[in-house]
Interface confidence: low
């Protein structure tokens, strides 16, 4: 159905509150440096305009596209040239180039300081004083730090955030109530951001086909009772939703996501028996619930895969007549039977199956050629299984911090050219896979670990793309989405690396280290470890262990000293000299 006014259509569908929130998120994701007040003003003006168009669709400018309206609004920002430099040139372009230009300027690493919560009393006062402004500030702060955050999901988290304050600001001990709840929400938000960034990268770098394949595998595992046509329909709609959000079309994205939730609830009988309680919730919670819903039970009477994909005489005919549909069916059938496999592994198996058919269907005797195809999957399955087993054993032995350090050493040796903050950030996140997945039952470990690693390695790829310094990282990131993790796992020590010159400043520490929270203290130590490795890449694990042990003792000693700063300035150079001698 064609609407006279696109903006009125979205305003009517979404309602004023969600509309205003999404506009605020969109502007904050595009103009990440602008102050909150400027964005509130822009969002208010756009919402007022949309409301006027909803009242009178043939009003002036109401027929303009959303990109035109939003772009025109962004280009009115006076400080655009000063704050964003090149980005101001976007305003000289016509749509759709102008929007593409804004998208290309999104900064995945804007370098804002981490959000530090003020005192609970001050927070509660601000919350009670102006709830709408308080939640708007939350949307703004998350959106500008995460320019690809899945906008409808961010509205959901803002609602959760509101719930936490509504509850805890009534509590006797506000801090005790807020602390753990805010921290738990923060973890969820960070994971959500990384997952959506991975989806956007899949779409932007590898195209719709890659994203659809990923979604077919994931949804087939989750809804094994649904038939392939139903999975395909949901995947097609889901692809549209994520393409819109990744492309900055947040109003369309949120609207289409609500429509998809409605469709799934109206057709739950043919999708999954687990959707019932999600479908009774309001729209934001409903969509979130559906996205997180537990896996349905497998149907009991699934025939062997071999019948359709190996033994059937028509395999090559079926493949050649409709390659993507046939391969999609294979992926669907394999995934629904193997909920314990990671999505990445399932996609590798489908790729292997495709390569086998390409080769065999061109021979004189295809059935003989592909007869053992399913047996040939074994090494592909064994590789992630062994990797998870080995790394979980290491995690259990070392604990999270020790495991992170082991990964830091591993990844710094693989790609020493990568910036130290990136190596520290990525290795710390990779290390969290242990905490997140190793305690799970065997049947869930691989899926948890490998799919989480894919998301974290995507962060490395995104950061590296901004300033490419390592050919091998570029290669692993760009050659194949499903083989990224095996590619990184397979990287050996970079023998071509020329050690970094020693810089005493890098290893100079001060008393302020003592007052840092534990996590930040760890980051400082891990930064020193990376720098040490960049200076002495041939250092053995044993040597590094000794040096890091000495470093920990040095920090502990100086933080306990009467004159902390004096201790750091006196003992620090001795430690550095000893470390250099130990690492010769």
């Amino acid at each position: 159905e064609a609407y006279k006014s696109e903006i009125a259509h979205r305003y009517n569908d979404l309602g004023e509150e969600h509309f205003r929130g999404l506009v605020l998120v969109a502007f904050s994701q595009y103009l990440q440096q602008c102050p909150f007040e400027d964005h509130v003003k822009l969002a208010k003006e756009v919402t007022e305009f949309a409301k006027a168009c909803a009242a009178e669709e043939s009003g002036a400018n109401c027929d303009k596209s959303l990109h035109t309206l939003f772009g025109d609004k962004l280009c009115t920002v006076a400080s655009l040239r000063d704050k964003y430099g090149d980005m101001a040139d976007c305003c000289e372009k016509q749509e759709p180039d102008r929007n593409e230009c804004f998208l290309a300027h999104k900064d995945d690493n804007p370098g804002f300081p981490p959000l530090v919560a003020p005192e609970p009393d001050a927070l509660c006062a601000a919350f009670q004083d102006n709830e709408q402004l308080f939640l708007g500030k939350y949307l703004y702060e998350i959106a500008r730090r995460h320019p690809y955050f899945y906008a409808p999901e961010l509205l959901y988290y803002a609602q959760q955030y509101k719930g936490v304050f509504a509850e805890c600001c009534q509590a006797a001990d506000k801090a005790a109530c807020l602390g753990p709840k805010i921290e738990a929400l923060r973890e969820k938000v960070l994971l959500s951001s990384a997952k959506e960034r991975f989806k956007c990268a899949s779409l932007q770098k590898f195209g719709d086909r890659a994203f659809k394949a990923w979604s077919v595998a994931r949804l087939s595992q989750r809804f094994p009772k649904a038939d392939f046509a139903e999975i395909s329909k949901v995947v097609t709609d889901l692809t549209k939703v994520h393409k819109e959000c990744c492309h900055g079309d947040l109003l369309e994205c949120a609207d289409d996501r609500a429509d998809l939730a409605k469709y799934m609830c109206e057709n739950q009988d043919s999708i999954s028996t687990k959707l019932k309680e999600c479908c009774d919730k309001p729209v934001l919670e409903k969509s979130q619930c559906l996205a997180e819903v537990e896996r349905d039970e497998l149907p009991g009477d699934l025939p062997s895969l071999a019948a359709d994909f190996v033994e059937d005489k028509e395999v090559c005919k079926n493949y050649q007549e409709a390659k993507d549909v046939f391969l999609g069916t294979f992926l669907y059938e394999y995934a629904r039977r193997h909920p314990e496999y990671s999505v990445s592994l399932l996609l590798r198996l489908a790729k292997e199956y495709e390569a086998t058919l390409e080769k065999c269907c061109a021979t004189d005797d295809p059935p003989t050629c592909y007869a053992k195809v399913l047996d040939e999957f074994k090494p592909l399955v064994d590789e992630p299984q062994n990797l998870v087993k080995t790394n979980c054993e290491l995690f259990e032995k070392l604990g999270e911090y020790g495991f992170q350090n082991a990964l830091l050493v591993r990844y710094t040796k693989k790609a020493p050219q990568v910036s130290t903050p990136t190596l520290v950030e990525v290795s710390r996140k990779l290390g969290k896979v242990g905490t997140k997945c190793c305690k799970k039952p065997e049947s869930e470990r691989m899926s948890c670990a490998e799919d989480f690693l894919s998301v974290v390695l995507n962060r490395l790829c995104v950061l590296h793309e901004k300033t490419p310094v390592s050919e091998r990282v570029t290669k692993c990131c760009s050659e194949s989405l499903v083989n990224r993790r095996p590619c990184f796992s397979g990287l050996e020590v970079d023998e071509t690396y020329v050690p970094k010159e020693f810089n005493a400043e890098t290893f100079t520490f001060h008393a302020d280290l003592c007052t840092l929270p534990e996590a930040e203290k760890q980051v400082k130590k891990q930064t020193a470890l990376v720098e040490l490795l960049k200076h002495k890449p041939k250092a053995t694990d044993e040597q590094l262990k000794t040096v890091m042990g000495d470093f920990g003792a040095f920090v502990e000693k100086c933080c306990a000293a009467e004159n902390k700063e004096g201790c750091f300035s006196e003992e620090g150079p001795k430690l550095v000299a000893a470390a250099q001698a130990a690492l010769v």
Epitope: D86, M87, D97, E100, C101, L103, S478
Partner: nanobody, 126 residues
């Protein structure tokens, strides 16, 4: 490492046209932001036109807008500059420059480009 090699320069009359090519090796051209700069005798390097990495967003200096067109052929790993309605003041050595990493937007600042070709001379004179 990116190697760039320009060609297509020469002598042309005012109002005439030329097409410059820049062949890249060592990295795919669509993975880098690339630009044309020029340097007239006794002057500094001046941005002419650029195209973003991973996205075909083009930029032009005001002095060439509407006359010059930048494009690339990913299959040939080559960047082009189609120059029409040439004027005597377009006389210069034209350089192709690359700034790896996508989706980077081209910049008009020469210092931000680590890789340069050796240049090709364009002379506009009657």
């Amino acid at each position: 490492e990116v190697q760039l090699l320009e060609s297509g320069g020469g002598l042309v009359q005012p109002g005439g046209s030329l097409r410059l090519s820049c062949a890249a090796s060592g990295r795919y051209i669509d993975e880098t932001a690339v630009a044309w700069f020029r340097q007239a005798p006794g002057k500094g390097r001046e941005f002419v036109a650029g195209i973003g990495g991973g996205v075909d967003i083009t930029y032009y200096a005001d002095s060439v807008k509407g006359r010059f067109t930048i494009s690339r052929d990913n299959s040939k790993n080559t960047l082009y500059l189609q120059m029409n309605s040439l004027r005597p003041e377009d006389t210069a050595v034209y350089y192709c420059a690359a700034r790896p990493g996508r989706p980077l937007i081209t910049s008009k600042v020469a210092d931000l480009y680590p890789y340069w070709g050796q240049g090709t001379l364009v002379t506009v004179s009657s």
